[in-house]
């Protein structure tokens, strides 16, 4: 069964700065994938960046650098003052729609005990809901 | 043939603002999004924002993010740009331009251009 | 944001020549993911509007005359007119496609001798 797995980690240098990282554990194709904050992408989160294989990537502010990391992995860098500031809590959903798996999403945030500089672990997160 | 007819030059006052509009055709204009550029002698071409036409979202560079408004008339295929608190550092050509086929920012065809003039 | 910086700012060449102009981008614009780079190049005649040449670095844009050759990869790309022709007379941008903001170059001016 594919999974979705997102780490999310808080720059020490930056506090408002945060850096997602999500990957897709599938055979499949990737034909997308969208990253918003939160919740998850059509269920009242709003979108940050959507990266597409041949078309480039569109990205959205807060949003500063969204890049392909490998063939089924991404990252993005954040970072926001004021009302687009994200803050320790926030959630950051990654939905990666591939062939023939369909769509896969899942959600992460920051550990409770978190210090900056840390990170969650990049294993798969709790919320994971297939299309 | 995909075409893109901007409105004509215009000559404004400090302060006032201006609306200007691109007008597509050759395509199906809620497929693809519309992007606009400034051009200066300065500063060459600076990317402003991009409008989704299909749900009139938007998508603005930091520097324009207080200075232009993005919008769209479905019914009638046009895309149109609102610049305001004009100073003499908006004086420019913008144009409009198209969301490539293959790619979200090779853009693949472009209106004539518009001229902005800011004068007292 | 990435930026372009192109050079030289003008250059004037013999109608046959051929001629290579240069653009380096602050950041790569190789995707991981398919191993393209998201590189456009632009010409723009005096009075005109810009037109696509060139997208990912070496796609030539259907129209576009087969002497113009984007060359080039991650950070480093090059265009070349393998023979210059008297409507070549332009203005010659590149732009990163690879993600928002699209940026460009500031330009290099091309005169006919």
């Known amino acids: 069964t594919p999974e979705v797995w997102v780490q999310v980690r808080m720059e020490a240098t930056e506090l408002s700065s945060f850096t997602i990282r999500c990957g897709f554990l599938g055979s499949g194709s990737i034909s997308l994938v969208t990253v918003s904050w939160g919740g998850p992408n059509g269920a009242g989160g709003t979108t940050l960046a959507v990266l597409h294989p041949e078309r480039g990537i569109r990205q959205w502010a807060p949003a500063r650098q969204a890049r392909w990391e490998t063939q089924s992995s991404i990252s993005l860098i954040l970072e926001g003052s004021g009302a687009s500031s994200p803050c320790a809590n926030t959630t950051f959903c990654c939905k990666f729609a591939s062939f023939p798996e369909g769509s896969w999403e899942a959600c992460g945030s920051l550990p409770p005990s978190s210090d900056p500089g840390l990170s969650a672990p990049p294993t798969p997160a709790p919320i994971l809901r297939a299309d | 043939e995909v075409h893109l007819q901007q409105s004509g030059p215009e000559l404004v006052k400090p302060g006032a603002s201006v609306k200007i509009s691109c007008k597509a055709s050759?395509?199906?204009?809620?497929?693809?999004?519309m992007n606009w550029m400034k051009q200066s002698h300065g500063k060459g071409l600076e990317w402003i924002g991009e409008?989704?036409?299909?749900?009139?979202?938007?998508n603005y560079s930091q520097k324009f993010r207080d200075k232009a408004t993005l919008t769209v008339d479905k019914s009638s295929n046009t895309a149109f740009m609102k610049l305001r608190s004009l100073t003499s550092e908006d004086s420019a050509v913008y144009f409009c331009?198209?969301?490539?086929?293959?790619?979200?920012?090779?853009?693949?065809?472009w209106g004539q251009g518009t001229s902005v003039t800011v004068s007292s | 944001d990435i930026v372009m910086t192109q050079s030289p700012s003008s250059l004037a060449m013999s109608v046959g020549q051929k001629v290579t102009m240069s653009c380096k981008s602050s950041?790569?614009?190789?995707?991981?993911?398919?191993?393209?780079?998201?590189l456009a190049w632009y010409q723009q005649k005096p009075g005109q509007s810009p037109k696509l040449l060139v997208s990912?670095?070496?796609t030539r844009e259907s129209g576009v005359p087969d002497r113009f050759i984007g060359g080039g990869s991650g950070t480093d790309f090059t265009l070349t007119i393998s023979s210059v022709q008297p409507e070549d007379l332009a203005d010659y941008f590149c732009q990163q496609h690879y993600s928002t903001p699209p940026t460009f170059g500031e330009g290099t001016k091309l005169e006919i001798k």
């Open positions: 409008i989704n036409p299909k749900n009139g979202d938007t």
């Open positions: 950041q790569s614009l190789l995707s991981s993911n398919n191993q393209k780079s998201f």
């Open positions: 990912f670095a070496s």
């Open positions: 050759g395509y199906t204009f809620t497929d693809y999004y």
């Open positions: 331009a198209k969301e490539g086929v293959g790619s979200y920012y090779a853009m693949d065809y």
